[in-house]
């Protein structure tokens, strides 16, 4: 899972994808469901090796949680050839891999 | 616990529409995809398609297309199938299920519809 | 889409003896779930994630494969594992197998 700390480093990792699917994981430190999730996340990140996984922290990266319109956390959304395919919001397991599976 | 109850069989004429309901209980549908499977009499299973209850997002196997429409009621806790112009190729045990990726899955008991003039 | 192909179609076995049903995928998947079914009961979760046995499975059951071979192979055949068996992907459009129809002899 690879930590997103800028807008070039997001926007560069979903151009480097090609046309892999991208997860994106935006959470912040103090959300409980957050830290909740987070080691399925990472199981995910495993089990799904031809899928790019990213984690952005909301605070530290304000514009690109912004930029994508996130207004609650943990809120999961999917890129595919930089074009946004899908998203929800809540610390959703079940959902969160049947979503990988319709689109990668 | 979970459950998934479905409404009792269906004789329906030829041409006529049916329409099928799965009330979860144990679980907010929500939360997570909600898939229907056909079972033709001594045949094998046949994914028809799911919805997604928190936002209507369906999606259907090519072949039921615009046979199948699947809808769902969060206020409820129920999804449905309807199935239109009916023939006997439709008569099948329809099922509701909570396909999940681990160790447990869900399904309903089974509705049975029987095509017969 | 992708579809799945199970053999053999009909098998039977006697108490004791190994069995191995397969499934064949037209395309490459990441992983193999199957099923246990007996007339008139709705379908059981029985291997998922291709290896994995679901709660409540015996030990005697295992799941192997990846690609587009998979297999379920019984070590020693019981009486109760007599069902059709059905193997399953969850891709964008999820498909079944038509079964492996498993007889005690």
């Known amino acids: 899972v690879k930590q997103i700390e800028s807008k070039t480093a997001f926007q560069e990792a979903l151009d480097a994808a090609g046309d892999k699917l991208v997860v994106v994981d935006f959470s912040a430190t103090w959300c409980g469901p957050c830290k909740m999730i987070k080691p399925f996340y990472h199981s995910l990140s495993e089990k799904y090796s031809n899928v790019i996984f990213l984690e952005v922290d909301v605070d530290d990266c304000q514009d690109v949680a912004s930029e994508c319109e996130v207004k609650c956390m943990p809120t999961f959304q999917f890129f595919k050839k930089g074009q946004k395919v899908g998203e929800f919001s809540g610390a959703n397991k079940e959902k969160l891999e049947a979503t990988i599976n319709e689109l990668v | 616990e979970v459950q998934l109850q479905q409404s009792g069989a269906e004789l329906v004429k030829p041409g006529a529409s049916v329409k099928l309901s799965c009330t979860a209980s144990?679980?907010?549908?929500?939360?997570?995809?909600m898939h229907w499977v056909k079972q033709r009499p001594e045949q094998g299973l046949e994914w028809i398609g799911r919805i997604d209850p928190a936002n209507g997002n369906t999606k259907y196997d090519p072949k039921f297309q615009g046979k199948a429409t699947i809808t769902a009621d969060t206020s409820s806790n129920t999804a449905y199938l309807q199935l239109s112009s009916l023939t006997s190729e439709d008569t099948a045990v329809y099922y509701c299920?909570?396909?999940?990726?681990?160790?447990?899955?869900?399904w309903g008991q089974g509705t049975s519809v029987t095509v017969s003039s | 889409q992708i579809v799945l192909t199970q053999s053999p179609a009909i098998m039977s076995a006697s108490p004791g003896e190994k069995v191995t049903m397969t499934c064949s995928a037209s395309s490459r998947i990441s992983y193999m779930y199957w099923y246990q079914q007996k007339p008139g009961t709705s379908p059981k979760r029985w291997i998922y994630?291709?290896?994995k046995l679901a709660s409540g499975v015996p030990a005697r059951f295992s799941g192997s494969g990846s690609g587009t071979s998979y297999s379920l192979t019984i070590s020693t055949m019981e009486a109760e594992d007599a069902a059709t068996y059905y193997c399953h992907q969850r891709s964008s459009y999820p498909t079944f197998g038509a079964g492996t129809k498993l007889e005690l002899k």
């Open positions: 144990g679980f907010n549908i929500k939360d997570t995809f």
């Open positions: 299920a909570l396909l999940q990726y681990s160790a447990m899955d869900y």
């Open positions: 994630d291709t290896s």
